[in-house]
Interface confidence: low
């Protein structure tokens, strides 16, 4: 239904707290360099304006669209051109072009310092002094670094953060209470960020149809007892929610997500028997819980998939009459039978099925042509299964850090032109798949591994798009979203690459490395490893292991030395010489 004032409608639906949080996220995601105080001032102005519209929907400007209201606010910021360069040109455009322009200027890798967590005592002091401002800072800092973060989920993580601080700041040992809990939230939020970015990429590059196909597969796996009409309704609603969030319409997105959660909880009987625990929770927790609810028990009496999609005499007729619906039912039926497959794999199978029907239904004897289609799925299924087995075996043998290093070597050989920080970030993230997925039961490994890898590789593609340097990466990133992971896996050593010359300063270290946290130490070592591979792309695993072991030994020795500086300055050059010799 149409509302006289869109902003009043959203304020009423969401309530002041969520309204303000979402407006702050929106501004922080659009203008990523502005300080918290600048954004907080704008948020207050928008909120005050919303309240005047709630009181009188006919008041001046209350009938304007949210894009117009928010865009006007952003464009009124002083020194916009000095701080944001050509983004200021967006302000010369009219809606909807202006919002599109803002979206195009979102930076997936803003040059902002890493979000450092203050020490426990300081954090608790500022949280107790003003919890609202403290949480505002959290929303602002995360949103500006992750301009596509799923806004209602970010409110959920802020709520988690709040609960942890409330609990831990009352404890004697605040540090040991806060650290593991906040680390847990951070890890989950980072995964949520790359997953959502993947959804927005799917929407931006391939449109709503591609996203809806993803949603149908995912929902069918989770709710195998729901019928196709129910799955289609949920997929349509979920597509709308994600389209809004990816498009910067955060108030509408959060509102529609709450509506979808309400619908699911009111229609459990036709969706799933596993929803009640989620439905008992308050809004943010409820929606989060529903998004990762366990799979319902599969119906026991499902007929073989071949009956309707291979053996039926009407296959080509059904396909011709309504292609999207027929392919949708295939995807639904296949997915509900296979919670053990990744969504990417299911979409590849549906694509293969579609291509087979396109070819066969034009032939003289279609059933003879498409009769073997299910057998032809076998290699498509085996490939990711082998990937999971090989990588999980390697993870179990090497542990997370060693596994990350193996991936770093592999990917540096595949795309040595890519910047070292990007390769290290990608390898560290890809390497976490072991800890995240390889410890799961067998039937959950494949969906976990492949869908996580796909999301990480999407980030690699986004960063590469900004400065394309590798033909290998461009090739894999140009294809369809579901083919990316197999494409990257199939890449081998880039034979066109001219090795980097050996620079001693790249491998020169100082005593400051000794005081770094373990994670930062690892990144330094991994940076050196990537540089070694760039120098010698065809170095054997054995050669690289020798050099890295020597390097680790050198660090250990010098960091324990009484005179660290002298140790680094005398032993460092010896290490460099040994490295060169080992790789010669």
């Amino acid at each position: 239904e149409a509302h006289k004032s869109e902003i009043a409608h959203r304020y009423n639906d969401l309530g002041e707290q969520h309204f303000k949080g979402l407006v702050l996220i929106a501004f922080s995601q659009y203008l990523q360099k502005c300080s918290y105080d600048e954004h907080a001032k704008l948020v207050q102005e928008v909120t005050d304006f919303a309240k005047t519209c709630v009181a009188d929907e006919s008041a001046a400007n209350c009938d304007k669209s949210l894009h117009t209201l928010f865009g006007d606010k952003l464009c009124a910021i002083p020194n916009l051109r000095e701080n944001y360069g050509e983004l200021a040109d967006c302000c010369t455009k009219q809606e909807p072009e202006r919002n599109e322009c803002f979206l195009q200027h979102k930076d997936d890798n803003p040059s902002l310092p890493p979000f450092e967590r203050p020490e426990a005592e300081a954090m608790c002091t500022s949280f107790k002094e003003n919890p609202t401002t403290f949480m505002g800072h959290y929303l602002h800092e995360v949103a500006r670094r992750h301009p596509y973060f799923y806004a209602p989920e970010l409110l959920y993580y802020a709520e988690q953060y709040n609960e942890i601080l409330t609990q831990c700041c009352a404890e004697a040992d605040k540090e040991s209470c806060l650290t593991p809990k906040l680390d847990g939230v951070k890890e989950k939020a980072l995964v949520s960020s790359v997953r959502q970015r993947m959804k927005c990429s799917s929407m931006q590059k391939f449109g709503e149809r591609a996203f809806k196909a993803w949603a149908v597969a995912r929902l069918s796996q989770t709710f195998p007892n729901a019928d196709f009409a129910e799955i289609t309704k949920l997929a349509t609603d979920l597509t709308k929610v994600n389209k809004e969030c990816c498009h910067g319409d955060l108030l509408e997105c959060a509102d529609d997500r709450a509506e979808l959660a309400k619908y699911m909880c009111e229609n459990q009987a036709t969706i799933s028997s596993k929803l009640q625990t989620c439905c008992d929770k308050p809004l943010l927790k409820k929606a989060h819980c529903l998004s990762e609810v366990e799979h319902d028990t599969m119906p026991a009496d499902l007929p073989a998939i071949a009956a309707d999609f291979v053996e039926d005499q009407e296959v080509c007729k059904n396909y011709a009459e309504a292609k999207d619906v027929f392919l949708g039912t295939f995807l639904y039926e296949y997915s509900r039978r296979h919670p053990d497959y990744s969504v990417s794999l299911l979409l590849r199978l549906a694509k293969k099925y579609e291509a087979t029907l396109e070819k066969c239904c034009a032939e003289a004897n279609p059933p003879a042509c498409y009769g073997t289609v299910l057998a032809e799925f076998q290699p498509l299924v085996e490939e990711p299964k082998n990937l999971v087995k090989t990588n999980c075996d390697l993870y179990e043998k090497l542990g997370e850090y060693g596994f990350q290093n193996a991936i770093l070597v592999r990917y540096t050989q595949k795309a040595p032109q890519v910047s070292t920080p990007t390769l290290v970030e990608a390898a560290r993230n890809l390497g976490r798949v072991g800890t995240k997925c390889c410890t799961l039961p067998e039937d959950q490994r494949l969906p976990c591994v492949e869908d996580y890898l796909s999301a990480i590789l999407n980030r690699v593609c986004l960063l590469h798009e900004k400065t394309p340097v590798s033909e290998h990466v461009t090739k894999c990133c140009s294809g369809s979203l579901v083919e990316r992971r197999p494409c990257f896996s199939a890449l081998t050593v880039d034979e066109t690459y001219v090795p980097k010359e050996f620079k001693a300063e790249t491998f020169t270290f100082h005593s400051d490395i000794c005081t770094l946290p373990e994670k930062e130490k690892q990144i330094k070592k991994q940076t050196a490893l990537a540089e070694l591979v760039k120098h010698k792309p065809k170095a054997t695993a054995e050669q690289l292991k020798t050099v890295m072991d020597d390097f680790a030994q050198f660090l250990d020795t010098c960091c324990k030395a009484a005179d660290k500086d002298t140790c680094f300055s005398t032993e460092g050059p010896n290490l460099v010489t040994r490295c060169k010799d080992a790789l010669a």
Epitope: E266, Q268, Q276, C279, D280
Partner: nanobody, 115 residues
Framework: EVQLVESGGGLVQPGGSLRLSCAAS????????MSWVRQAPGKGPEWVSA????????RYAESIKGRFTISRDNAKKTLYLQMNSLKPEDTAVYYC????????GSQGTQVTVSS
């Protein structure tokens, strides 16, 4: 199609008893928690009581605790509400719902407590 049909309501004097039934069809009744909800004239829906899918875990609103008992028979796909020591303020239309929701997907049964 999911259907819930309530019965057993009526006019009763204060202190009296009634037993409401809710016959379910169109879904796997034994897999879902169920609730009773009521709506008094001119008021919003009020959650009354809930029971889990197996019938072991029951919950009650403060206003009816000790007077009402919720139960179910999964073989018969039926939910029950035994109402004792009824009071005039229990007058309302009673609905059964799937899960612990206050949304009404059925016609309900009228309970009137009056002398």
């Amino acid at each position: 199609e999911v259907q819930l049909v309530e019965s057993g309501g009526g006019l009763v004097q204060p202190g009296g008893s009634l037993r409401l039934s809710c016959a379910a069809s169109g879904f796997t009744f034994g897999s879902f928690g169920m609730s009773w909800v009521r709506q008094a004239p001119g008021k919003g829906p009020e959650w009354v009581s809930a029971i889990d899918s197996g019938g072991t875990d029951t919950r009650y609103a403060e206003s009816i605790k000790g007077r009402f008992t919720i139960s179910r028979d999964n073989a018969k796909k039926t939910l029950y509400l035994q109402m004792n020591s009824l009071k005039p303020e229990d007058t309302a239309v009673y609905y059964c719902t799937i899960g612990q929701s206050t949304s009404r997907g059925s016609q309900g049964t009228q309970v009137t407590v009056s002398s």
